[in-house]
């Protein structure tokens, strides 16, 4: 017999076909010899089936000898034998039904558990195969889980479902609740305006929820809550703020906030969370902010970085337009009894400046200039 | 897999440019500092200088100031190192090298490439 | 700039035995901001580009069998082959990438006696 695989919620079409290219008198089946449908003449008749008001035809089909019967909203519980009566001839075609459900919610905050659930007749035993919207294939029964979800597993998950040598394929769409990105630094210098922005990799119609930054100075023992906000329908509000530093927050999407001046005691890490209505746990982006002071005292020359910077980077003091006077994996150099001119303190990755600060070296009778 | 291809050996004379090649593949071109470092016959190695391929800054040894120029080709993924007013002394081997991820020490480098300079 | 000094300049050491090699900086190249020393330890076979197998003065590099080892901190230096295998025969250099500019050892050649 024929086997032919449907999904939950869609509309199937089982063919019967006559030897005779005219309409003629057939009856559609289930296993349990219960009339579905069939035809009186050009009347489309009714059995007394559970598929009732589901359950039509293709008259227009009916005068090349093609008697379909179609079931639409499939569910599971329509996985049967189906029996088309014509000509004296039974044609049998088996149905099969399967679901493919997303165990919560499609929209999932990230590090969370995504499973899919694979609802299927008694008696049959599909394999599952999925591919997710970066190309990672996982296979399973029944369920597949996949834990801990990123950012790039948000989009088109397609799924295809195996069984008797046929397939068919559920398309789902998953959003993966997130800010762009889970990390970013900040290079600044003492005394400049300093701009944190948290941009979110996802857009819906409505946000609501509240958030908080939790700042950890490098210079301090413990962490501190430096702003709390809400979040009604992608409107932010400020709930509470510290005296010092005191920081603005803008009132719209993308959240954004400003610290007034970049300051030594300030660079260090944060992290900011935002907690959504209806959704269990939190998102999270980690922001770093690094300042950079160039000094003059007396004959001393220094340069220094505060905050969480690589091993990697290389901190420079050199005169404009000459070779670097110091060159050092440190987070202060100094230059002794420096020549006058402007000099120029370089913190940079494999040659990329990623902060400059600049100090004018006048002659030993003058006091220093900072531009 | 990760590797830095080199272009081929080259003769030149005295006063003249060379521009040797390097490209890269197996690994993401933008995230890793290229120094370049060279090695004449029978001597040690000699570091010249290093270029960030995601902005293409530079960083040059004080010795080659002024006669190196170090350049990249992203869409390549290929950097290049030109030396000009060449002189006998600067026959050697040049070699590129990737910085580590987490250090800068030299993980991966160049198959190198023999430059002649002879009148 | 910083002096890197090997010694030996060559060294003979029988198959199985232990091979020491020095490394001297003419400054120290321990961060005192990040707590690291910036030294490294490569190998180089004839006709071959230089191989990394120690950063970080003691953290070998991907790899590298664990006969090899760094050790030494500030401006003193060592790498150790505890038991000498026939491939090992090469010139070994220290290098410091503390400062630039990046500076290497004049080498070490190691053979077998």
């Known amino acids: 017999k024929k086997v032919v695989l449907g999904k939950k919620g869609d509309t199937v079409e089982l063919t019967c076909t006559a030897s005779q290219k005219k309409s003629i008198q057939f009856h559609w089946k289930n296993s349990n010899q219960i009339k579905i449908l069939g035809n009186q003449g050009s009347f489309l008749t009714k059995g007394p089936s559970k598929l009732n008001d589901r359950a039509d035809s293709r008259r227009s089909l009916w005068d090349q000898g093609n008697f379909p019967l179609i079931i639409k909203n499939l569910k599971i519980e329509d996985s049967d034998t189906y029996i088309c009566e014509v000509e004296d001839q039974k044609e049998e075609v088996q149905l099969l039904v399967f679901g493919l459900t997303a165990n919560s919610d499609t929209h999932l905050l990230q590090g969370q558990s995504l499973t899919l659930t694979l609802e299927s007749p008694p008696g049959s035993s599909p394999s599952v195969q999925c591919r997710s919207p970066r190309g990672k294939n996982i296979q399973g029964g029944k369920t597949l889980s996949v834990s801990q979800l990123e950012l790039q597993d948000s989009g088109t998950w397609t799924c295809t479902v195996l069984q008797n040598q046929k397939k068919v394929e559920f398309k789902i769409d998953i959003v993966v609740l997130a800010f762009q990105k889970a990390s970013s630094i900040v290079y600044k210098k003492e005394g400049e305006q300093v701009e944190f922005s948290f941009p979110l990799a996802f857009t819906v119609e409505k946000l609501t929820g509240s958030g908080e930054l939790w700042w950890q100075a490098e210079r301090a023992s413990s962490s501190k809550s430096w702003i709390t906000f809400d979040l009604k329908n992608k409107e932010v509000s400020v709930k509470r703020v510290t005296q010092d530093p005191k920081l603005q927050m803008g009132k719209k999407l993308p959240l954004h906030l400003t610290l007034p001046q970049a300051l030594p005691q300030y660079a260090g890490s944060g992290n900011l969370t935002l907690a959504l209505e209806a959704k269990t746990g939190k998102l999270h982006q980690e922001v770093n902010l690094v300042v950079m002071r160039a000094t003059q005292l007396q004959k001393n020359l220094t340069c220094e970085v505060w905050g969480p910077t690589s091993p990697k980077l290389m901190l420079s003091l050199k005169l404009e337009n000459k070779e670097a006077k110091v060159s050092k994996r440190e987070k202060a150099v100094w230059v002794l009894n420096p020549e006058a001119g402007m000099w120029q303190c370089l913190l940079s990755d494999s040659g990329q400046v990623l902060l400059e600060s600049n100090i004018k070296v006048l002659p030993t009778w003058s006091t220093p200039v900072q531009p | 897999q990760v590797q830095l291809v080199q272009s081929g050996a080259e003769v030149k004379k005295p006063g003249a440019s060379v521009k040797v090649s390097c490209k890269a593949s197996g690994f993401t071109f933008t995230d890793y500092g290229i120094s370049w470092v060279r090695q004449a016959p029978g001597q040690g190695l000699e570091w010249m200088g290093i270029?960030?391929?995601?902005?293409?800054?530079?960083s040059y040894a004080q010795k080659f100031q002024g006669r190196v120029t170090m350049t990249r080709d992203t869409s390549t993924s290929t950097v290049y190192m030109e030396l000009s007013s060449l002189r006998s002394e600067d026959t050697a081997v040049y070699y590129c090298a990737r910085e580590g991820r987490s250090h800068d020490a030299f993980d991966i480098w160049g198959q190198g490439t023999m430059v002649t300079v002879s009148s | 700039d910083i002096v890197m000094t090997q010694s030996p300049d060559s060294l003979a050491v029988s198959l199985g035995e232990r091979a020491t090699i020095n490394c001297k900086s003419s400054?120290?190249?321990?961060?005192?901001?990040?707590?690291?020393?910036?030294l490294a330890w490569y190998q180089q076979k004839p006709g071959q580009p230089p191989k990394l197998l120690i950063y970080?003065?003691?953290t070998r590099a991907s790899g590298v069998p664990d006969r090899f080892s760094g050790s030494g901190s500030g401006t003193d230096f060592t790498l150790t082959i505890s038991s000498l295998q026939a491939e090992d025969v090469a010139v070994y250099y220290c290098?410091?990438?503390?400062?630039?500019?990046?500076?290497f050892g004049q080498g070490t050649k190691l053979e077998i006696k």
């Open positions: 290098q410091q990438y503390y400062s630039t500019p990046f500076t």
């Open positions: 400054q120290s190249v321990l961060s005192s901001s990040y707590n690291k020393n910036y």
């Open positions: 270029i960030n391929p995601s902005g293409g800054s530079t």
């Open positions: 970080w003065a003691s």
